[in-house]
């Protein structure tokens, strides 16, 4: 599978310093590759813009939680 092996890696080198409203967010994906300098979250907005954010920040964790909760009802 050479295409998969040589697939480009997306990295975040800078994080947004602005809190983004959850109403503007459509999805997220985590960046975990060892080829990247830091772990990150990439949010995709409802207008398909991608924004790098720091997963250690509470608003980022809350936003990820919100996006996940939209698709399933929690027990607690």
């Amino acid at each position: 599978q050479p295409d998969a092996i040589n697939a480009p890696v997306t990295c975040c080198y800078n994080f947004t310093n602005r809190k983004i409203s959850v109403q503007r967010l459509a999805s997220y994906r985590r960046i975990t590759s060892s080829k990247c300098p830091k772990e990150a979250v990439i949010f995709k907005t409802i207008v398909a813009k991608e924004i790098c954010a720091d997963p250690k920040q509470k608003w980022v964790q809350d936003s990820m939680d919100h996006l996940d909760k939209q698709t399933q009802t929690p027990k607690t």
Epitope: S27, R29, R30, T32, K56, Q61, M64, K69, P74, K75
Partner: nanobody, 124 residues
């Protein structure tokens, strides 16, 4: 390099209990939702339970609700699955995984970095 190592499986009689552990390394554990899945011989991988990054929200498959409890200790980089009132149909290999994509907690494609699994066998 991300690693997940499960432990705590074994052979138990129906009605018994087990506590599974999944120790994670190579990532900032406290910022990731985690899930437990299981796979019985000849069957597809099945969602069991999941927990959000802070541990405040938990999610369960209908088949284990009221019997299984998922929890996490972010200081120890470990997620747990307490399994009570075990049934023969709970027999499977249980694996933990890291959730890296938004969406349903019960969907395996949303997860990555699967552990090697731990065997749980429930005899009648």
């Amino acid at each position: 390099e991300v690693q997940l190592v499960e432990s705590g499986g074994g052979l138990v009689q129906a009605g018994g209990s087990l506590r599974l552990s999944c120790a994670a390394s190579g990532l900032t554990f406290s910022t990731y939702p985690m899930g437990w899945f299981r796979q019985a011989p000849g069957k597809e991988r099945e969602f069991v339970a999941a927990i959000n990054s802070g541990g405040s929200s938990t999610y369960y498959a209908d088949s284990v609700k009221g019997r299984f409890t998922i929890s996490r200790d972010n200081a120890k980089n470990t997620v747990y699955l307490q399994m009570n009132s075990l049934k023969p149909e709970d027999t499977a290999v249980y694996s933990c995984a890291v959730k890296i994509y938004s969406g349903s907690y019960s969907s395996p494609p949303g997860y990555n970095y699967w552990g090697q699994g731990t065997q749980v066998t429930v005899s009648s």
